[in-house]
């Protein structure tokens, strides 16, 4: 039994880091393998992660972390029984994938304006809380070419757009994702999408 693709890990910079790897053949990850992880720090002890299958030869492990700070560093040991298959390290702050924003809502009751709001996925005491920026994706269910991205570079989790920038009388969907420049993170996953019917009064055309 050998590791074909070494574990790579990303952290949500809150409580979970996710590590993925591939074995050289079909593997029952949960019965055959264990990933031990230990914070490199005074009086820390190793924790055991039981991996799950992720495709035939792929494995994924969700490492639970009680806290995360910029200086954290973990040792990782992948075991198959008594055999050490791989040894490595992981610094969560260097591999951050933020949590996806939640509670995306489209408010259509403001005249001729669409207000999109969502929730910051971090609590106020987390470092990322004040460092997230967002991308909002809006698309038409009827027209695949009607697809747009709005970059929200301010901290407030909201976006206002004129209803008239979208076609009237058709349904749209929106979703939002986040990233943090401070840690050069990857983008989060997209939030679940939300749907609304766009309708507004067309201005009378003057001839």
């Amino acid at each position: 039994m050998k590791v074909l693709q070494e574990p790579t890990c990303v952290s949500d910079y809150m409580s979970i880091s996710t590590c993925e790897w591939k074995m050289n053949g079909p593997t029952n990850c949960s019965t055959e393998l264990r990933l031990l992880y230990q914070l490199v720090f005074l009086l820390s002890e190793a924790h055991t992660c039981i991996p799950e299958n992720n495709g035939g030869a792929g494995c994924v492990c969700h490492l639970l972390m009680d806290d995360v700070v910029s200086a954290d560093n973990y040792t990782l040991d992948l075991w198959a029984g008594q055999q050490l298959l791989w040894k490595g390290s992981f610094k969560p702050s260097e591999h951050v994938k933020p949590r996806a924003p939640g509670n995306l809502t489209v408010h259509t009751n403001v005249s001729d304006t669409l207000l999109l709001t969502w929730s910051n996925p971090y609590p106020p005491d987390n470092y990322l809380y004040n460092h997230l920026t967002y991308a909002v994706n809006i698309w038409s269910e009827n027209d695949p070419a009607d697809f747009r991205i709005y970059n929200v570079t301010y901290l407030e989790p909201s976006l206002r757009i004129a209803a008239s920038t979208l076609k009237s009388g058709i349904s749209y969907r929106a979703r939002v994702r986040a990233w943090a420049q401070c840690y050069n993170t990857t983008w989060s996953e997209w939030s679940p999408s939300t749907k609304w019917h766009n309708s507004y009064r067309e201005p009378f055309e003057q001839h």
């Epitope: 914070l39 720090f41 005074l42 009086l43 820390s44 002890e45 009680d66 806290d67 700070v69 200086a71």
Partner: antibody, heavy 118, light 107 residues
Amino acid sequence: EVQLVESGGGLVQPGRSLRLSCEASGFTFDDYAMHWVRQAPGKGLEWVSGLSRTSVSIGYADSVKGRFTISRDNAKNSLYLEMNSLRPEDTALYYCAKWGTRGYFDYWGQGTLVTVSS
Amino acid sequence: DIQMTQSPSSVSASVGDRVTITCRASQDISIWLAWYQQSPGKAPKLLINVASRLQSGVPSRFSGSGSGTDFTLTINSLQPEDFVTYYCQQANSFPITFGQGTRLEIK
């Protein structure tokens, strides 16, 4: 509510022994490392000893190494400090403290006073 | 052993003032530094952890900064209950060591 209650202090002659206890409640005791910190009358804080969740890792201050032994009983939510060959300079208020995983003591007991004198 | 040197050892100030206490480590301790407040006859109370994180329940007038060897604790708009003793503590390596303390007195 986290509570740490120390006991076992008292007046003891130089060269004798004493065993301190700390009873913990309000948190999952076996998830955290624990420590003893002392403070001589009118002086600053001095770290004495600490041990990890399952006692696989232990540290001592040079001043107590070889004389003091730290231990814990996770089933009883209790921390102990066995103090042998006590010296007058060990006279202090001994605090039990919970380790906050990133190098800080987030909860402290009220302390138990150890006086070493003939 | 890592020596922690606090300065000043005592400082006089008035209610409403801003005070800064510094702590210097004899070698690099990254961000593994905490600050405590101790009132007479009481156990120490954690104020700041990992150099700059405010402990839950601690008033926002307290703040910490620094990394490596130089750290500061700042108290803005001093309140009467702040006139007590403050300690820094490193946890980069054993033995864990504290600064000698800074006593904050009313002017």
